[in-house]
Amino acid sequence: MMTGTIETTGNISAKKGGSVILQCHLSSTMAQVTQVNWEQHDHSLLAIRNAELGWHIYPAFKDRVAPGPGLGLTLQSLTMNDTGEYFCTYHTYPDGTYRGRIFLEVLESSVAEHSARFQIP
Protein backbone atom coordinates (compact mmCIF):
# COMPACT_ATOMS: atom_id res chain seq x y z
CA MET A 1 0.00 0.00 0.00
CA MET A 2 1.30 3.44 -0.95
CA THR A 3 1.13 5.67 2.11
CA GLY A 4 3.58 8.35 1.02
CA THR A 5 2.99 11.87 -0.17
CA ILE A 6 5.03 14.00 -2.56
CA GLU A 7 5.48 17.56 -1.39
CA THR A 8 6.70 20.03 -4.02
CA THR A 9 7.57 23.69 -4.31
CA GLY A 10 4.20 24.07 -6.08
CA ASN A 11 3.79 27.15 -8.26
CA ILE A 12 7.00 29.15 -8.46
CA SER A 13 8.28 32.11 -10.41
CA ALA A 14 11.79 33.20 -11.27
CA LYS A 15 13.58 35.85 -13.29
CA LYS A 16 14.61 35.35 -16.89
CA GLY A 17 18.36 34.72 -16.93
CA GLY A 18 18.28 33.62 -13.31
CA SER A 19 18.11 30.18 -11.75
CA VAL A 20 15.55 28.17 -9.84
CA ILE A 21 15.57 25.08 -7.64
CA LEU A 22 13.05 22.38 -8.47
CA GLN A 23 12.47 20.32 -5.35
CA CYS A 24 10.22 17.43 -4.42
CA HIS A 25 10.13 15.63 -1.10
CA LEU A 26 8.65 12.23 -0.34
CA SER A 27 7.17 11.96 3.14
CA SER A 28 4.94 9.68 5.24
CA THR A 29 6.58 6.49 4.02
CA MET A 30 9.56 4.35 4.96
CA ALA A 31 10.00 3.29 1.32
CA GLN A 32 13.51 3.44 -0.11
CA VAL A 33 13.93 5.88 -3.01
CA THR A 34 15.74 4.04 -5.79
CA GLN A 35 15.46 6.64 -8.55
CA VAL A 36 14.07 10.11 -9.19
CA ASN A 37 13.30 11.27 -12.73
CA TRP A 38 12.83 14.92 -13.63
CA GLU A 39 10.78 15.72 -16.73
CA GLN A 40 9.74 18.91 -18.48
CA HIS A 41 6.25 20.05 -19.57
CA ASP A 42 6.31 17.99 -22.78
CA HIS A 43 7.44 14.96 -20.73
CA SER A 44 10.95 15.19 -22.14
CA LEU A 45 13.67 14.06 -19.74
CA LEU A 46 15.74 16.62 -17.86
CA ALA A 47 17.63 14.39 -15.46
CA ILE A 48 17.71 11.12 -13.53
CA ARG A 49 19.11 10.61 -10.07
CA ASN A 50 19.70 6.92 -9.38
CA ALA A 51 20.55 6.00 -5.80
CA GLU A 52 23.37 3.67 -6.91
CA LEU A 53 24.57 5.14 -10.20
CA GLY A 54 24.32 8.84 -9.43
CA TRP A 55 23.12 11.52 -11.83
CA HIS A 56 22.32 11.43 -15.52
CA ILE A 57 21.69 14.85 -17.03
CA TYR A 58 20.09 14.98 -20.47
CA PRO A 59 23.00 16.06 -22.71
CA ALA A 60 21.30 19.08 -24.27
CA PHE A 61 20.68 20.52 -20.78
CA LYS A 62 24.07 19.69 -19.28
CA ASP A 63 25.30 23.27 -19.52
CA ARG A 64 22.35 24.73 -17.60
CA VAL A 65 21.02 21.98 -15.35
CA ALA A 66 22.91 21.37 -12.13
CA PRO A 67 22.29 18.31 -9.95
CA GLY A 68 20.88 18.97 -6.51
CA PRO A 69 20.46 20.12 -3.88
CA GLY A 70 19.68 16.60 -2.72
CA LEU A 71 17.32 14.88 -5.12
CA GLY A 72 16.29 18.24 -6.56
CA LEU A 73 17.47 20.04 -9.65
CA THR A 74 18.78 23.54 -10.29
CA LEU A 75 17.74 25.05 -13.60
CA GLN A 76 20.02 27.92 -14.66
CA SER A 77 20.06 30.65 -17.34
CA LEU A 78 16.28 30.62 -17.47
CA THR A 79 14.46 31.59 -20.66
CA MET A 80 10.80 32.32 -21.23
CA ASN A 81 10.54 28.90 -22.88
CA ASP A 82 11.24 27.28 -19.51
CA THR A 83 7.79 28.37 -18.32
CA GLY A 84 5.56 25.35 -17.77
CA GLU A 85 5.07 22.17 -15.80
CA TYR A 86 7.85 20.04 -14.33
CA PHE A 87 7.38 16.57 -12.93
CA CYS A 88 9.35 14.54 -10.42
CA THR A 89 8.82 10.79 -10.51
CA TYR A 90 10.00 8.83 -7.48
CA HIS A 91 10.62 5.12 -7.94
CA THR A 92 10.56 3.52 -4.51
CA TYR A 93 10.81 0.11 -2.93
CA PRO A 94 8.50 -1.43 -1.92
CA ASP A 95 5.83 1.22 -2.53
CA GLY A 96 6.23 1.80 -6.26
CA THR A 97 6.01 5.10 -8.12
CA TYR A 98 5.05 8.55 -6.80
CA ARG A 99 4.73 11.66 -8.96
CA GLY A 100 4.83 15.34 -8.15
CA ARG A 101 4.15 18.48 -10.20
CA ILE A 102 5.70 21.94 -10.13
CA PHE A 103 4.62 24.90 -12.26
CA LEU A 104 7.38 27.36 -13.12
CA GLU A 105 6.67 30.80 -14.48
CA VAL A 106 9.66 32.67 -15.89
CA LEU A 107 9.15 36.43 -15.70
CA GLU A 108 10.77 39.29 -17.58
CA SER A 109 10.06 41.57 -14.66
CA SER A 110 12.79 42.34 -12.13
CA VAL A 111 10.25 41.87 -9.35
CA ALA A 112 10.05 38.12 -10.04
CA GLU A 113 10.48 36.25 -6.83
CA HIS A 114 11.39 32.62 -6.42
CA SER A 115 8.93 31.17 -3.93
CA ALA A 116 10.56 28.37 -1.97
CA ARG A 117 7.58 27.26 0.07
CA PHE A 118 6.57 23.61 -0.09
CA GLN A 119 3.04 22.55 -0.78
CA ILE A 120 1.17 19.33 -1.43
CA PRO A 121 -0.10 19.28 -5.02
Epitope: I48, W55, H91, T97
Partner: antibody
Framework: EVQLVQSGAEVKKPGASVKVSCKAS????????MHWVRQAPGQRLEWMGR????????KYNEKFKSRVTITVDKLSSTAYMELSSLRSEDTAVYYC????????????WGQGTTVTVSS | DIVMTQSPDSLAVSLGERATINCRVS??????LAWYQQKPGQSPKLLVY???TLAEGVPDRFSGSGSGTDFTLTISSLQAEDVAVYYC?????????FGPGTKVDIK
Protein backbone atom coordinates in the same frame (compact mmCIF):
# COMPACT_ATOMS: atom_id res chain seq x y z
CA GLU B 1 29.54 11.15 -36.83
CA VAL B 2 30.09 9.86 -33.30
CA GLN B 3 33.30 7.83 -33.05
CA LEU B 4 35.04 6.16 -30.13
CA VAL B 5 38.51 4.97 -31.07
CA GLN B 6 40.32 2.74 -28.59
CA SER B 7 44.00 1.95 -28.12
CA GLY B 8 45.55 -1.23 -29.45
CA ALA B 9 45.79 -4.75 -28.04
CA GLU B 10 47.88 -5.35 -24.92
CA VAL B 11 49.63 -8.40 -23.50
CA LYS B 12 50.37 -8.21 -19.79
CA LYS B 13 51.85 -10.40 -17.09
CA PRO B 14 49.84 -11.34 -13.97
CA GLY B 15 50.11 -8.64 -11.32
CA ALA B 16 50.74 -5.87 -13.84
CA SER B 17 48.42 -2.98 -14.76
CA VAL B 18 46.91 -1.96 -18.06
CA LYS B 19 45.60 1.41 -19.19
CA VAL B 20 43.22 1.53 -22.16
CA SER B 21 42.34 4.78 -23.91
CA CYS B 22 39.21 5.83 -25.78
CA LYS B 23 39.30 8.95 -27.96
CA ALA B 24 35.90 10.47 -28.63
CA SER B 25 34.94 12.63 -31.61
CA UNK B 26 31.82 13.85 -33.38
CA UNK B 27 30.06 15.19 -30.27
CA UNK B 28 30.61 17.38 -27.21
CA UNK B 29 32.71 15.11 -25.00
CA UNK B 30 31.75 16.70 -21.67
CA UNK B 31 28.00 16.40 -22.30
CA UNK B 32 27.90 12.60 -22.29
CA UNK B 33 28.91 10.17 -19.57
CA MET B 34 31.25 7.34 -20.57
CA HIS B 35 31.04 3.68 -19.56
CA TRP B 36 33.54 0.83 -19.62
CA VAL B 37 32.35 -2.72 -20.27
CA ARG B 38 34.36 -5.89 -20.77
CA GLN B 39 33.70 -9.24 -22.41
CA ALA B 40 35.75 -12.32 -21.59
CA PRO B 41 35.90 -15.01 -24.30
CA GLY B 42 32.48 -16.64 -24.71
CA GLN B 43 31.07 -14.69 -21.75
CA ARG B 44 28.37 -12.09 -21.27
CA LEU B 45 29.17 -8.41 -21.18
CA GLU B 46 30.27 -7.09 -17.78
CA TRP B 47 29.89 -3.45 -16.74
CA MET B 48 32.89 -1.93 -14.95
CA GLY B 49 31.94 1.69 -14.30
CA ARG B 50 31.01 5.12 -15.65
CA UNK B 51 32.41 8.63 -15.50
CA UNK B 52 31.08 12.15 -15.99
CA UNK B 53 33.74 13.77 -18.21
CA UNK B 54 32.59 17.21 -17.11
CA UNK B 55 33.10 16.75 -13.36
CA UNK B 56 35.36 13.68 -13.34
CA UNK B 57 32.96 11.97 -10.93
CA UNK B 58 32.78 8.21 -11.35
CA LYS B 59 30.82 5.17 -10.20
CA TYR B 60 32.22 1.64 -10.22
CA ASN B 61 30.99 -1.92 -10.15
CA GLU B 62 31.82 -3.12 -6.62
CA LYS B 63 33.50 -6.18 -8.15
CA PHE B 64 36.22 -3.97 -9.69
CA LYS B 65 36.21 -1.06 -7.27
CA SER B 66 39.59 -1.77 -5.67
CA ARG B 67 41.33 -2.38 -9.02
CA VAL B 68 39.81 -0.07 -11.62
CA THR B 69 40.25 3.67 -12.17
CA ILE B 70 38.37 5.57 -14.86
CA THR B 71 39.64 9.02 -15.79
CA VAL B 72 39.28 11.56 -18.59
CA ASP B 73 41.38 14.19 -20.32
CA LYS B 74 38.93 16.87 -21.41
CA LEU B 75 41.44 18.66 -23.64
CA SER B 76 41.95 15.60 -25.84
CA SER B 77 38.38 14.22 -25.40
CA THR B 78 39.83 10.95 -24.20
CA ALA B 79 38.62 8.54 -21.53
CA TYR B 80 40.90 6.04 -19.80
CA MET B 81 40.35 2.82 -17.92
CA GLU B 82 43.18 1.45 -15.80
CA LEU B 83 42.94 -2.03 -14.30
CA SER B 84 45.58 -3.14 -11.80
CA SER B 85 46.67 -6.45 -10.24
CA LEU B 86 45.84 -8.28 -13.44
CA ARG B 87 45.06 -11.99 -13.39
CA SER B 88 44.34 -14.48 -16.16
CA GLU B 89 40.56 -14.03 -15.68
CA ASP B 90 40.98 -10.39 -16.78
CA THR B 91 41.74 -11.57 -20.31
CA ALA B 92 38.92 -9.94 -22.26
CA VAL B 93 37.89 -7.36 -24.81
CA TYR B 94 37.43 -3.99 -23.10
CA TYR B 95 34.95 -1.49 -24.55
CA CYS B 96 34.28 2.17 -23.89
CA UNK B 97 30.69 3.13 -24.56
CA UNK B 98 28.95 6.49 -24.53
CA UNK B 99 25.92 6.85 -22.28
CA UNK B 100 22.64 7.43 -24.11
CA UNK B 101 20.45 10.53 -24.03
CA UNK B 102 17.75 9.12 -21.78
CA UNK B 103 19.50 7.06 -19.13
CA UNK B 104 22.25 4.68 -18.16
CA UNK B 105 22.34 2.50 -21.30
CA UNK B 106 25.05 2.94 -23.98
CA UNK B 107 24.30 4.24 -27.46
CA UNK B 108 27.75 4.18 -29.13
CA TRP B 109 30.59 1.72 -28.52
CA GLY B 110 34.30 1.73 -29.24
CA GLN B 111 35.80 -1.03 -31.39
CA GLY B 112 37.17 -2.82 -28.32
CA THR B 113 40.67 -3.42 -26.97
CA THR B 114 41.88 -6.98 -26.41
CA VAL B 115 43.83 -7.40 -23.19
CA THR B 116 45.58 -10.73 -22.71
CA VAL B 117 46.98 -11.63 -19.31
CA SER B 118 49.51 -14.44 -19.52
CA SER B 119 52.71 -15.44 -17.78
CA ASP C 1 23.04 -7.62 -8.08
CA ILE C 2 20.11 -7.73 -10.49
CA VAL C 3 20.22 -11.05 -12.33
CA MET C 4 19.29 -11.19 -16.01
CA THR C 5 18.27 -14.41 -17.72
CA GLN C 6 17.44 -14.90 -21.40
CA SER C 7 15.53 -17.54 -23.29
CA PRO C 8 16.10 -19.34 -25.48
CA ASP C 9 19.90 -19.71 -25.48
CA SER C 10 19.73 -19.92 -29.26
CA LEU C 11 17.14 -20.09 -31.99
CA ALA C 12 17.06 -20.72 -35.73
CA VAL C 13 14.37 -18.97 -37.75
CA SER C 14 13.57 -19.02 -41.46
CA LEU C 15 14.16 -15.83 -43.44
CA GLY C 16 11.10 -13.61 -43.26
CA GLU C 17 9.77 -15.35 -40.14
CA ARG C 18 9.35 -13.90 -36.65
CA ALA C 19 12.03 -14.28 -33.94
CA THR C 20 11.18 -13.71 -30.28
CA ILE C 21 13.71 -13.39 -27.47
CA ASN C 22 12.75 -13.17 -23.81
CA CYS C 23 14.55 -11.52 -20.93
CA ARG C 24 13.63 -12.07 -17.29
CA VAL C 25 14.92 -9.87 -14.51
CA SER C 26 15.29 -10.82 -10.84
CA UNK C 27 13.54 -7.66 -9.59
CA UNK C 28 11.33 -4.85 -10.82
CA UNK C 29 13.24 -2.53 -13.13
CA UNK C 30 10.15 -0.70 -14.44
CA UNK C 31 10.96 -0.07 -18.13
CA UNK C 32 14.71 0.46 -17.75
CA LEU C 33 15.84 -2.25 -20.14
CA ALA C 34 18.01 -2.08 -23.25
CA TRP C 35 18.64 -4.58 -26.05
CA TYR C 36 21.91 -4.87 -27.97
CA GLN C 37 22.94 -6.77 -31.08
CA GLN C 38 26.47 -8.13 -31.40
CA LYS C 39 27.75 -9.67 -34.59
CA PRO C 40 30.89 -11.87 -34.57
CA GLY C 41 34.04 -9.80 -34.12
CA GLN C 42 32.08 -6.57 -33.69
CA SER C 43 31.11 -4.25 -30.85
CA PRO C 44 27.58 -4.33 -29.44
CA LYS C 45 25.03 -2.11 -31.16
CA LEU C 46 22.11 -0.51 -29.31
CA LEU C 47 18.71 -1.58 -30.64
CA VAL C 48 16.19 -0.61 -27.95
CA TYR C 49 16.22 1.37 -24.70
CA UNK C 50 13.55 2.05 -22.07
CA UNK C 51 12.12 -1.38 -23.01
CA UNK C 52 10.38 -0.25 -26.17
CA THR C 53 12.05 2.81 -27.70
CA LEU C 54 13.91 2.00 -30.91
CA ALA C 55 17.39 3.50 -31.17
CA GLU C 56 18.19 5.83 -34.03
CA GLY C 57 18.66 4.07 -37.36
CA VAL C 58 17.35 0.69 -36.19
CA PRO C 59 14.95 -0.96 -38.69
CA ASP C 60 11.33 -1.09 -37.55
CA ARG C 61 11.23 -4.88 -37.85
CA PHE C 62 12.80 -4.76 -34.37
CA SER C 63 10.51 -4.02 -31.44
CA GLY C 64 10.71 -4.25 -27.67
CA SER C 65 8.01 -4.76 -25.09
CA GLY C 66 7.49 -5.52 -21.42
CA SER C 67 7.93 -3.86 -18.05
CA GLY C 68 8.70 -4.88 -14.48
CA THR C 69 10.51 -8.20 -14.72
CA ASP C 70 9.55 -9.66 -18.12
CA PHE C 71 10.68 -8.26 -21.46
CA THR C 72 10.67 -9.31 -25.10
CA LEU C 73 12.62 -8.40 -28.22
CA THR C 74 10.85 -9.28 -31.46
CA ILE C 75 12.24 -9.35 -34.99
CA SER C 76 9.09 -9.39 -37.09
CA SER C 77 10.68 -10.61 -40.32
CA LEU C 78 14.17 -12.05 -39.93
CA GLN C 79 16.79 -10.88 -42.43
CA ALA C 80 20.17 -12.46 -43.15
CA GLU C 81 21.94 -9.48 -41.55
CA ASP C 82 20.12 -10.13 -38.25
CA VAL C 83 22.26 -13.19 -37.51
CA ALA C 84 23.94 -12.19 -34.23
CA VAL C 85 23.90 -12.57 -30.47
CA TYR C 86 21.31 -10.41 -28.68
CA TYR C 87 21.82 -9.17 -25.12
CA CYS C 88 19.43 -7.51 -22.71
CA UNK C 89 20.72 -5.09 -20.08
CA UNK C 90 18.98 -3.29 -17.25
CA UNK C 91 19.83 0.39 -16.85
CA UNK C 92 18.46 0.89 -13.36
CA UNK C 93 21.12 0.28 -10.69
CA UNK C 94 24.72 -0.51 -9.83
CA UNK C 95 26.01 -2.74 -11.23
CA UNK C 96 24.44 -2.54 -14.64
CA UNK C 97 24.13 -6.18 -15.70
CA PHE C 98 23.60 -8.00 -18.98
CA GLY C 99 21.85 -11.20 -19.91
CA PRO C 100 23.88 -14.20 -21.14
CA GLY C 101 22.83 -13.59 -24.74
CA THR C 102 20.63 -15.33 -27.30
CA LYS C 103 22.21 -16.52 -30.55
CA VAL C 104 19.98 -16.06 -33.60
CA ASP C 105 20.67 -18.05 -36.77
CA ILE C 106 18.96 -18.73 -40.08
CA LYS C 107 17.08 -22.02 -40.35
Amino acid sequence: EVQLVQSGAEVKKPGASVKVSCKASGYTFTNYYMHWVRQAPGQRLEWMGRIDPDSGGSKYNEKFKSRVTITVDKLSSTAYMELSSLRSEDTAVYYCAREGHYGFYSDYWGQGTTVTVSS
Amino acid sequence: DIVMTQSPDSLAVSLGERATINCRVSENIYSYLAWYQQKPGQSPKLLVYNAKTLAEGVPDRFSGSGSGTDFTLTISSLQAEDVAVYYCQHHYGNPLTFGPGTKVDIK
